[in-house]
Amino acid sequence: QRLPRMQEDSPLGGGSSGEDDPLGEEDLPSEEDSPREEDPPGEEDLPGEEDLPGEEDLPEVKPKSEEEGSLKLEDLPTVEAPGDPQEPQNNAHRDKEGDDQSHWRYGGDPPWPRVSPACAGRFQSPVDIRPQLAAFCPALRPLELLGFQLPPLPELRLRNNGHSVQLTLPPGLEMALGPGREYRALQLHLHWGAAGRPGSEHTVEGHRFPAEIHVVHLSTAFARVDEALGRPGGLAVLAAFLEEGPEENSAYEQLLSRLEEIAEEGSETQVPGLDISALLPSDFSRYFQYEGSLTTPPCAQGVIWTVFNQTVMLSAKQLHTLSDTLWGPGDSRLQLNFRATQPLNGRVIEASFPAGVDSSPRAAEPVQLNSCLAAGD
C-alpha cells in the first residue's frame, strides 16, 4: 500500500529534493520509533502574554500601526518538569540567558495537559495519515507561495532554542491555502530523530520518516500570534517529510552547514537569505490537510496542517548532521524532538488528490466521506 513513485522533472535543491511519495510498508514503527512517553518530542515556539519580546525575537508580522510591545512568535512561556528523562533524549528548554522563564520538556512529569490544558484537547497534532481513508477534496487547489525566494541580505536568524533549530523569517512571505485563506510565514523549524531512529512528527500508515520541516504561518486576519492562537485557521503549518536520498540537498545545506555554530543550546547565528520554497517539495498540488494543534505546549488548536505528499530528499550525511550536532537542555543531545501521534477523534483528513485510489488496490474510487472543509471559504 504505497503510492507510486513520482517522476519529478525538476528536483529541488540541485537534484536532491523530494521525488518520493511518503508511503512505505516495510518500515513500520518499532517500539524505538518514538519515545515511550505520551508526549514525546516536538516544538512550535509561540508567544505568551507574560513574555514580552526582546530585540532579538522574531520580527513582528503585523500592520505598521500596531503598537510596539506586541507579542511575537517564540515568546510563549514553556514549562519544564523536574527530573531527568528515562531515555537519552531531549528534555527541557533552557536558554542560557533566560533561566527565569518556565519551560516544558519531553517525557516524564508533569504531563503536558497539566502544563497547558489544551494539550488534552480532542483535536491535537501530529496524527497518523492513512491515505486510503483521506477524503478527496477537489476544492483543495495548489498552494500559492509568494516572496519565499529571499535575497542574501538581510540575513536571517538561525537559533538553537533547545527543542529545535529555528529560522526566523522576515515579513513578506505570503502563502495561500486557497481563495481568501491567506497567511504570512513567521518561522520554520525541524523535527528529527537520532542515529537509526526516525523523527518525523506525522506518520503515514504508521511509517515515521527521518525528519520533518514545519513552516509556521499566521493568518492575515490576525495582527499577532496570541490573537490567532486557538482560533480556527488562525495559524497554518506547512509540513514536509525529509527522507534519505543519494545526493546532497543544496538548499538544506545552507542551513545544515551552519549548525555547528549554534551547537550550544540558546545560541544563534545569522545566515544569508535563501529560497525558502526550495526547502519544500516541488509539488504544491498534492497534499493532505486537517485541522489540529501546535505540537507542543500550549498545544493550541485550530491550526490548519498541510502535509505534502511528496517528500524532500537529503543525503545520509545531512540527516546525520541534523540529528548529531546540536545540544539541548539538561546538557543532553537535541534529538528525538517529536511528539507522539494523537488520535483523530472523528476528524477526517482531506487530500487534494485521490490518494485512496493510488495507495490501495482495494480502493475503487476516491473516498468522499464528507464535504470538504475548505469548500465555501
Epitope: A194, E260, E261, D324, R333
Partner: antibody, heavy 118, light 107 residues
C-alpha cells in the same frame, strides 16, 4: 596537517590565575570546536571545557566558576584562564580539536605542565 | 554528570593476546562513546568514535562495540606498540567525562 601547541608559564602561584594559549598551525581555527583537558600526574583525564570559534563556550561544572576560554581567530589561537588556582590544579594541560557529531578529540597538543606552588 | 567506569583498571597481557576493556556509563549514552590510547609522556590519541567507528589510520585490530550503558574496546592481537593506557569518553552529555583509564602492560 593541523598541529596544536600549548604555551604559558609552567609555574603559577596559589590564588593567581593560570593562563595558557593554544596555537593552531597547518590549518584554520575557524569552524571548529576546541577543547582544554588536563591530567594530574599519574591520574586520569579531566575535561575542562570547549569553545567554538564564534566564542560560544561550555565548561565543566566543577570548574565553571573559575574558567574562562577565549578565541582569537586572527592569531589562530584560543586560550584558557583558570583563576584562584591551588595545588590541586597542578597538571599537564592539553588543548585539542573536537569533531562535531561524535564530539571526540581528534587532534591534540603535546601538553604543557603547569605547577601551582609558592 | 554522567559517570564513566572502566574495568579492569589494569591488566597484563602478552603480544598476540586478545584484550577486552569494558567501559560503563552511569546512564544511557546511546552510542556516544569515544576511545583513546595514551602512552607515557604523550598526548592521548583518538582510536574509535561513536562506539564502533575506527578512526582513519588506526589498525583494524582495534574494534569497539556497545550502546546504551555498556561498551567494549577489543584489541584482537596485541602488538608491542599497544601497551598503553586506554580511556573512554562519553559525548552524549555536553559535559564530557572520561573513564578512569585501563592500563595495559606486558605480562
Amino acid at each position: 596537517q593541523v598541529q596544536l601547541q600549548e604555551s604559558g608559564p609552567g609555574l603559577v602561584k596559589p590564588s593567581e590565575t593560570l593562563s595558557l594559549t593554544c596555537t593552531v598551525s597547518g590549518g584554520s581555527i575557524s569552524s571548529y570546536y576546541w577543547s582544554w583537558i588536563r591530567q594530574p600526574a599519574g591520574k586520569g583525564l579531566e575535561w575542562i571545557g570547549r569553545i567554538y570559534t564564534s566564542g560560544s563556550t561550555n565548561y565543566n561544572p566543577s570548574l565553571k566558576s573559575r574558567v574562562t576560554m577565549s578565541v582569537d581567530t586572527s592569531k589562530n589561537q584560543f586560550s584558557l584562564k583558570l583563576s584562584s588556582v591551588t595545588a590541586a590544579d597542578t597538571a599537564v594541560y592539553y588543548c585539542a580539536r573536537l569533531i562535531t557529531g561524535p564530539y571526540g578529540m581528534d587532534v591534540w597538543g603535546q601538553g604543557t605542565t603547569v605547577t601551582v606552588s609558592s | 554528570d554522567i559517570q564513566m567506569t572502566q574495568s579492569p583498571s589494569s591488566l597484563s597481557a602478552s603480544v598476540g593476546d586478545r584484550v577486552t576493556i569494558t567501559c560503563r556509563a552511569s546512564q544511557s549514552i546511546s552510542s556516544y562513546l569515544n576511545w583513546y590510547q595514551q602512552k607515557p609522556g604523550k598526548a592521548p590519541k583518538l582510536l574509535i568514535y561513536t562506539a564502533s567507528n575506527l578512526r582513519g589510520g588506526v589498525p583494524s585490530r582495534f574494534s569497539g562495540s556497545g550502546s546504551g550503558t555498556d561498551f567494549t574496546l577489543t584489541i584482537s592481537g596485541l602488538q608491542p606498540e599497544d601497551f598503553a593506557t586506554y580511556y573512554c569518553q562519553q559525548s552524549y552529555s555536553s559535559l564530557f567525562t572520561f573513564g578512569p583509564g585501563t592500563k595495559v602492560d606486558i605480562k
